[in-house]
Interface confidence: low
Amino acid sequence: AITEAREEAKPYPLFPGPLPGSLQTDHTSLLSLPHTSGYQPALMFSPTQPGRPYTGNVAIPRVTSAGSKLLPPLAFKHTVGHIILSEHKDVKFNCSISVPNIYQDTTISWWKDGKELLGAHHAITQFYPDDEVTAIIASFSITSVQRSDNGSYICKMKINNEEIVSDPIYIEVQGLPHFTKQPESMNVTRNTAFNLTCQAVGPPEPVNIFWVQNSSRVNEQPEKSPSVLTVPGLTEMAVFSCEAHNDKGLTVSKGVQINIKAIPSPPTEVSIHNSTAHSILISWVPGFDGYSPFRNCSVQVKEVDPLSNGSVMIFNTSASPHMYQIKQLQALANYSIGVSCMNEIGWSAVSPWILASTTEGAPSVAPLNVTVFLNESRDNVDIRWMKPLTKRQAGELVGYRISHVWQSAGISKELLEEVGQNNSRAQISVQVHNATCTVRIAAVTKGGVGPFSDPVKIFIPAHGWVDHAPSSTPAPGNADPVLII
């Protein structure tokens, strides 16, 4: 496609010069005469048109091998200096030079902004030889130009170790404004000022910016890009975008949502994962964060008991993981549990409360009045005790654990017996004679084994001794257990 071409210099009148193939043979006029006429349209070049005097890089005149004739300086002919076209159009431009035939192996390379253009570019070089000179036309074409094609293009020719450089051809690809910075989504505090930035470039310049809030323009007068919009505060969510205008038209940025930070929504789905006698492991699903990161959470625990004083225990924890092990609870108790979380704005409401229970605990006291005596005729030891005064939280008594340790010279042996909850006495076989038997008893519930009673010792004599006196734990509050032998 032929594109709009505009020169920065004044255009020349149209000159219908001879076509390639009927080249001028007057070398002097061809290479070094000052310009007389010859407008050079952007996409049409004739190698025979005289160029305007060249002030750039030229090859110095050389003496021929015969030494009889000076050759004039070599220079690329002037061509269009500035091509302006719209994005996605095609463009073709060229540079031309006439080279005396005494120079061999001339090649032309294209350069853009100081870098050689290699590879898959549409560059074509055509040679039109005559008796003494060869006209060379190097064409460069770009299909569907983009902004990245903007720049200064030159031809270079190496000849006898000299470098000849053409005038630059500046390609300016114009299009709709292109955003280099668009507004970003933000979460802001209510009624607090914030800035949004929008920047767009051409060409063509200038680019003017209008700001849009919720589909309505905010500024009546456009601002030159870049533009910073200072919003002194919002009370509700808004969507902002910016419009960039230039002579080619309008581009609209993405719309960005400006959210107003608020307190979080309450957590949901509070769940019980594990209960023990004195702890409950809970988890929850966080609510909406109110456009501000969670900072921490608070687990609130109320005992559900008509006799409790209704106080709330509060346990603070980090916002993640969304789990917490509540400790220091009473055994076999019912609790109501809620969770609240906070962000920089404040605390959420409490989640829906859930009910949870701790399991039975182990007994907290040992059986009382433990007595032990030897029944020699049966070769066993009788043990008696009183049921401990366990609290409700310890749960239901399931039995007792009896520990008896037998010690004689060089021997120590511990045995454990389990008896049912209805018993308050037990008999154990004598394991060793001429030895000491130490007895301790603990109450057992589903929650575990309680503390053992203080030890009661009895001496088991060798066969033949008779002693029926019992050993017993003292009444509560007394000193060490008494051993009677």
Epitope: N191, A193, N214, S216, E220, L229, T230, P232, T235, E236
Partner: antibody, heavy 121, light 107 residues
């Protein structure tokens, strides 16, 4: 030139409501925020809130349950309804247009003539 | 909310004198301040915006200054038409708030 026309006076009974109007002319109504300001006799100025015909409303928390701002774009008129009126609501109510100098500079280059609301049985 | 404290509450002055009215904000308002004049029974009129800029048609004897939290309005060589009430107003976020006003009376 830019004008904001308001009726001169309204007499209303306690507990009733009143709807004040502010007719704009001389500028693009849909491009500017319209603000409402209260002035009790012999007192200072209190900002009630503002409305943008295409964007949203923004109220002073103090007046949120008292005032409701609306617009009729077809007639370039802004309205403020005041509800559950008491003697405390007796005042001059002004509408005011924000200045065109920049986007969010909420000061007022044009004020309405003001409507005097008297709440009396 | 940002509080605007204006002083003095009233001022008795003669024609030709110079007066200064001050306004203090409860926090930094970054020069987002306007001054208005109101005459008895009339609507307020904008005098100064953005702390220092004179509104269209305002005589040059009026000038605004200040930054941060402290602002002032100065009237040089007071004229008879300058008597009335003066209000400052911040526009650094909402709610917008006004000073309580300064009443300028003829001595």
């Amino acid at each position: 030139q830019v004008q904001l026309q308001q009726p001169g006076a309204e007499l209303v009974k306690p507990g009733a409501s009143v709807k004040l109007s502010c007719k704009a002319s001389g500028y693009t109504f849909t491009s500017y925020w319209m603000h409402w300001v209260k002035q009790r006799p012999g007192q200072g100025l209190e900002w009630i809130g503002m409305i943008h015909p295409n964007i949203n409303t923004n109220y002073n928390e103090k007046f949120k349950s008292k005032a409701t701002l609306t617009v009729d774009i077809s007639s370039s008129t802004a309205y403020m309804q005041l509800s559950s009126l008491t003697s405390e609501d007796s005042a001059v109510y002004y509408c005011a247009k924000r200045s065109p100098y920049s986007n969010y500079d909420w000061y007022f280059d044009v004020w309405g003539t003001g409507t005097t609301v008297t709440v009396s049985s | 909310d940002i509080q605007m404290t204006q002083s003095p509450a009233s001022l008795s002055v003669s024609v030709g004198e110079t007066v200064t009215i001050t306004c203090r904000a409860s926090e930094n308002i970054y020069s987002n301040l306007a001054w208005y004049q109101q005459k008895q029974g009339k609507s307020p009129q904008l005098l100064v915006y953005a702390a220092t800029n004179l509104a269209d048609g305002v005589p040059s004897r009026f000038s605004g200054s200040g930054s941060g939290t402290q602002y002032s309005l100065k009237i040089n060589s007071l004229q008879s038409e300058d008597f009335g009430s003066y209000y400052c107003q911040h526009f650094w976020g909402t709610p917008l708030t006004f000073g309580a006003g300064t009443k300028l009376e003829l001595k």
